[in-house]
Interface confidence: medium
């Protein structure tokens, strides 16, 4: 088991060395500006964010080919959720530094959960998206 | 208030069979997935099986698959074991659990424990 | 053995705080829960911590749990004598499609 398990650590590392999950990333992004856009901020207004998506992207047009784009890379993690819930943490890790504040995060980790359903995939069971936990409360 | 009461343990002989029953009360069991737990005396916790909320999908230990079956009637609210080929190893405490797993990222817990029942497996 | 590791016994005073280890692998740990349960003796064990960090009602804040990466940490502070008792940690493993419970932890409240 421990050199099947081995083999298995190695397939899913290759798989996620060669998969480009930036378009995943752009499109949460875009969707949780989009999201935050409708309740009532300007979405001309100048962004910091390096994935800050112009006002053509902001009408769905360009989140619509990063969501293409997006799950084509997803789908070469169909046949392995162990795989996939590694590669949905990876989208996570990449993004939380740049995620302002807890809501922010909560919006965009709400999405992620989302995103293997959004492209007709099963989402991996009992994946763990929290980055660094640390002791909360449940209530 | 929740409550979980296993009967059906006992003495067996190597070779035999038995099965244990747990009574549920106080929850809406068909929205839970449900969970067998064992402890060998003075050893730690050891899971058994798991079964979801309809009964679909079921996962057991290595050394009890084939043996064990994990069963649920949730108009009578009750979890079943049914244990064949029972050995010497298979005997401990075994528990009735309640498992808190909900959706795809989210985790198993136990948070509701039955007082378990005994399971003595000798010649 | 148990896959998930933690140390078979610690010891403090009260008052003090203490940490309970427990280490696994990117298959169980790395990807998945962790809880944590509180064994006094001769009775079923409880529920102290679930989904890495949180408490069920009725359990005080003096226990909190923390994860980072592949292992996990249940913290108690303000040790009592009444938290003498075997603490066992648990995840589930992806690859062996099973929950592994850890091997255990006796503490002793001197």
């Known amino acids: 088991r421990q050199q099947w398990e081995l083999q298995g650590d190695r397939r899913c590392q290759s798989q996620l060395e060669r998969a480009n999950l930036r378009p995943c990333e752009q499109h949460l992004m875009q969707k949780i500006q989009r999201d935050e856009d409708s309740y009532g901020r300007d979405p001309y207004s100048p962004s910091q964010d390096p994935y800050s998506p112009s006002p053509y992207d902001r009408r769905g047009a360009g989140s619509s080919q990063h969501q293409e784009r997006c799950c084509n890379e997803l789908n070469e993690f169909e046949n392995n959720q162990r795989c996939m819930c590694e590669a949905l943490q990876q989208i996570m890790e990449n993004q939380s530094d740049r995620l302002q504040g807890r809501q922010q995060e909560q919006q965009f980790k709400r999405e992620l959960r989302n995103l293997p359903q959004q492209c007709g995939l099963r989402a991996p069971q009992r994946c763990d998206l929290e980055v660094e936990s640390g002791g909360r409360d449940r209530y | 208030e929740v409550q979980l009461v296993e009967s059906g343990g006992g003495l067996v002989q190597p070779g035999g069979s038995l099965r244990l029953s747990c009574a549920a009360s106080g929850f809406k069991f068909s929205t839970f997935y449900m969970t067998w737990i064992r402890q060998a005396p003075g050893k730690g916790l050891e899971w058994v099986a798991n079964?979801?909320?309809?009964?679909?999908?079921?996962d057991y230990l290595d050394s009890v698959r084939g043996r064990f079956t994990i069963s649920r009637d949730n108009a009578k609210s009750s979890l079943y074991l049914q244990m064949n080929s029972l050995r010497a190893e298979d005997t401990a405490v075994y528990y009735c659990t309640r498992n808190g797993l909900q959706d795809s990222y989210s985790g198993d817990f136990f948070d509701h424990w039955g007082q378990g029942t005994l399971v003595t497996v000798s010649s | 053995q148990s896959v998930l590791t933690q140390p078979p016994s610690i010891s403090a005073a009260p008052g003090q705080k203490v940490t309970i280890s427990c280490s696994g692998t990117?298959?169980?740990?790395?990807?998945?829960?962790v809880s944590w349960y509180q064994q006094l003796p001769r009775t079923a064990p409880r529920l102290l911590i679930f989904d890495n960090t949180k408490r069920p009602s009725g359990i005080p804040d003096r226990f909190s749990g923390s994860k980072s990466g592949s292992s996990a940490t249940l913290g108690i502070t303000g040790l009592q004598t009444g938290d003498e008792a075997h603490y066992f940690c648990a995840t589930w493993d992806a690859d062996l499609s099973a929950v592994l419970f850890g091997g255990g932890t006796k503490l002793t409240v001197l």
């Open positions: 990117g298959s169980n740990i790395g990807h998945n829960y």
């Open positions: 079964i979801k909320q309809d009964g679909s999908e079921k």
